[in-house]
């Protein structure tokens, strides 16, 4: 019961986290105009990974996409890549974890298969969360670096725009959403990995016992074999339990490639 709860909670937490990573990636407020020097501006600038926006006090907002790839800074491209990798891994992880959920029955899927799938999705969530946290942190570091470089006509590193003296950028809401979402995905992944341990069937360890029968000696060793007493007609050793000794190579592989346009 505790395993199912841990797995279910891990799934839900990861789902919320990945939704947050997607939201953060799409948000325009990765960096927002610092209003410290001019709190009464009639024009408010903010920028995302995909476009920059200007909100006028009139109520109108104008957004312009970064229609260049080569003209964009490498750091911004790296952040985009990290966030997209995080989303793709998270999405695949969610897909795998749905089939791995203990409460969902799919054919005659063994617990060991579900355990491996749970572990796989858990690892994917952890990597997804780390990608998001890394992406957001790289962007935040870029902002901090650029913050004091607010000299006239400076290159902002954000879509090749020319900066006037007054405008500096600070952390936007998307950064905090990204950090929280990445953390949640990471936590969800860890919970899935913990649940995996509980899902994996436990090995029954039998201590080696030596039976000294007349004429011959047979040692019964642990490793998944249960012996009869050696007396009477049933003298065969029956393999009644696999002991979960399946190799990683035997784990069923799942699709890991999705097309995101």
């Amino acid at each position: 019961m505790a395993v199912t709860a841990c797995q279910g909670l891990g799934f839900v937490v990861s789902l919320i986290g990945i939704a947050g990573i997607i939201a953060a990636t799409c948000m325009d407020q990765w960096s927002t105009q610092d209003l410290y020097n001019n709190p009464v501006t009639a024009v408010f600038n903010y920028q995302g990974l995909w476009r920059s926006c200007v909100r006028e006090s009139s109520g109108f907002t104008e957004c312009r996409g970064y229609f260049t790839l080569l003209g964009l800074p490498a750091m911004l491209q790296a952040v985009r890549a990290l966030m997209i990798v995080g989303i793709v891994l998270g999405a695949i992880g969610l897909l795998v974890s749905i089939f791995a959920l203990k409460c969902i029955r799919i054919g005659s899927m063994e617990d060991s298969a579900k355990a491996n799938m749970t572990l796989t999705s858990g690892i994917m969530f952890i990597v997804s969360g780390l990608c998001a946290i890394a992406g957001v942190s790289v962007f935040a570091n870029m902002l901090v670096t650029n913050f004091w470089m607010s000299t006239a006509n400076m290159y902002t590193g954000m879509g090749g725009m020319v900066q006037t003296v007054q405008t500096r950028y600070t952390f936007g809401a998307a950064l905090f959403v990204g950090w929280v979402a990445g953390g949640l995905t990471l936590i969800g992944g860890v919970m899935m990995c913990i649940a995996c341990r509980g899902l994996a069937p436990e090995e029954t360890n039998y201590k080696a016992v030596s039976y000294h029968a007349s004429g011959h000696s047979v040692a019964y060793k642990p490793g998944g074999f249960k012996a009869s007493t050696g007396f009477g007609s049933n003298t065969k050793n029956k393999k009644i339990y696999d002991g979960g000794a399946r190799t990683e190579d035997e784990v069923q592989s799942y699709p890991s490639k999705h097309d995101y346009v």
């Epitope: 024009v43 006090s57 109520g59 109108f60 104008e62 007054q166 405008t167």
Partner: antibody, heavy 118, light 113 residues
Framework: EVQLVESGGGLVQPGGSLRLSCAAS????????MHWVRQAPGKGLEWVSY????????YYADSVKGRFTISRDNPKNSLYLQMNSLRAEDTAVYYC???????????WGQGTLVTVSS | DIVMTQSPDSLAVSLGERATINCKSS????????????LTWYQQKPGQPPKLLIY???TRESGVPDRFSGSGSGTDFTLTISSLQAEDVAVYYC?????????FGQGTKLEIK
């Protein structure tokens, strides 16, 4: 047709109060930031106050801060300017104006005259 | 506060001639986010409210004759009437719409010579 009609102006003694109204028609007021601008007789234009579409942001000129209060009633499509502690230098024609692209004032009312005199 | 200074205070131009009004701001009105200058030009005729002519320093408001044009960037701006008509007699104001308070220039009175 877009129209802004100011009302509430008149003669008032120094230290007195007045409430100006601006009725909008031909557009939905709650989509736009709104301004009050005044013009003393024979003088230039002076911006007075601004209120954002949702009333979340309000700004005043230093000359009226603490004495004037801008407000709006979007369901009634109306803008208001409550003027207290009036002074002789507040004598002017008061215009309400609708904000537009580039923060420009695209539409203006005909104005209402406020005279502060003893 | 941003101070707007217009020159000249008054201008007399012959019909059909070019009229040029200058406006200087004490701070740059260029916004880095969209590379637009937040300066507006208005025309005010006697007994009438002001009328919007130009916004974003160079974008003509719909319905405004194309003889009116705006130019300039940063702190220096110009309103040009390419061929003066009798109906263009008015006072012209530039306005900072970049930072509050939204200050106006003192106005330039345009007359026919």
């Amino acid at each position: 047709e877009v129209q802004l009609v100011e009302s509430g102006g008149g003669l008032v003694q120094p230290g007195g109060s007045l409430r100006l109204s601006c009725a909008a028609s031909g557009f939905t007021l709650n989509n736009f930031g709104m301004h009050w601008v005044r013009q003393a007789p024979g003088k230039g234009l002076e911006w007075v106050s601004y209120i954002s579409s949702g009333s979340g942001t309000i700004y005043y000129a230093d000359s009226v801060k603490g004495r004037f209060t801008i407000s709006r009633d979007n369901p009634k499509n109306s803008l208001y300017l409550q003027m207290n502690s009036l002074r002789a230098e507040d004598t002017a024609v008061y215009y309400c104006a609708r904000a537009y692209y580039g923060n420009a004032f695209s539409f203006w009312g005909q104005g209402t005259l406020v005279t502060v005199s003893s | 506060d941003i101070v707007m200074t217009q020159s000249p205070d008054s201008l007399a131009v012959s019909l059909g001639e070019r009229a040029t009004i200058n406006c200087k701001s004490s701070q740059s009105l260029l916004n880095s986010g969209n590379q637009k200058n937040y300066l507006t030009w208005y025309q005010q005729k006697p007994g009438q409210p002001p009328k919007l002519l130009i916004y974003w320093a160079s974008t003509r408001e719909s319905g405004v004759p194309d003889r009116f044009s705006g130019s300039g960037s940063g702190t220096d701006f110009t309103l040009t009437i390419s061929s003066l008509q009798a109906e263009d007699v008015a006072v012209y104001y530039c306005q900072n719409v970049y930072s509050y308070p939204l200050t106006f220039g003192q106005g330039t009175k345009l007359e026919i010579k």
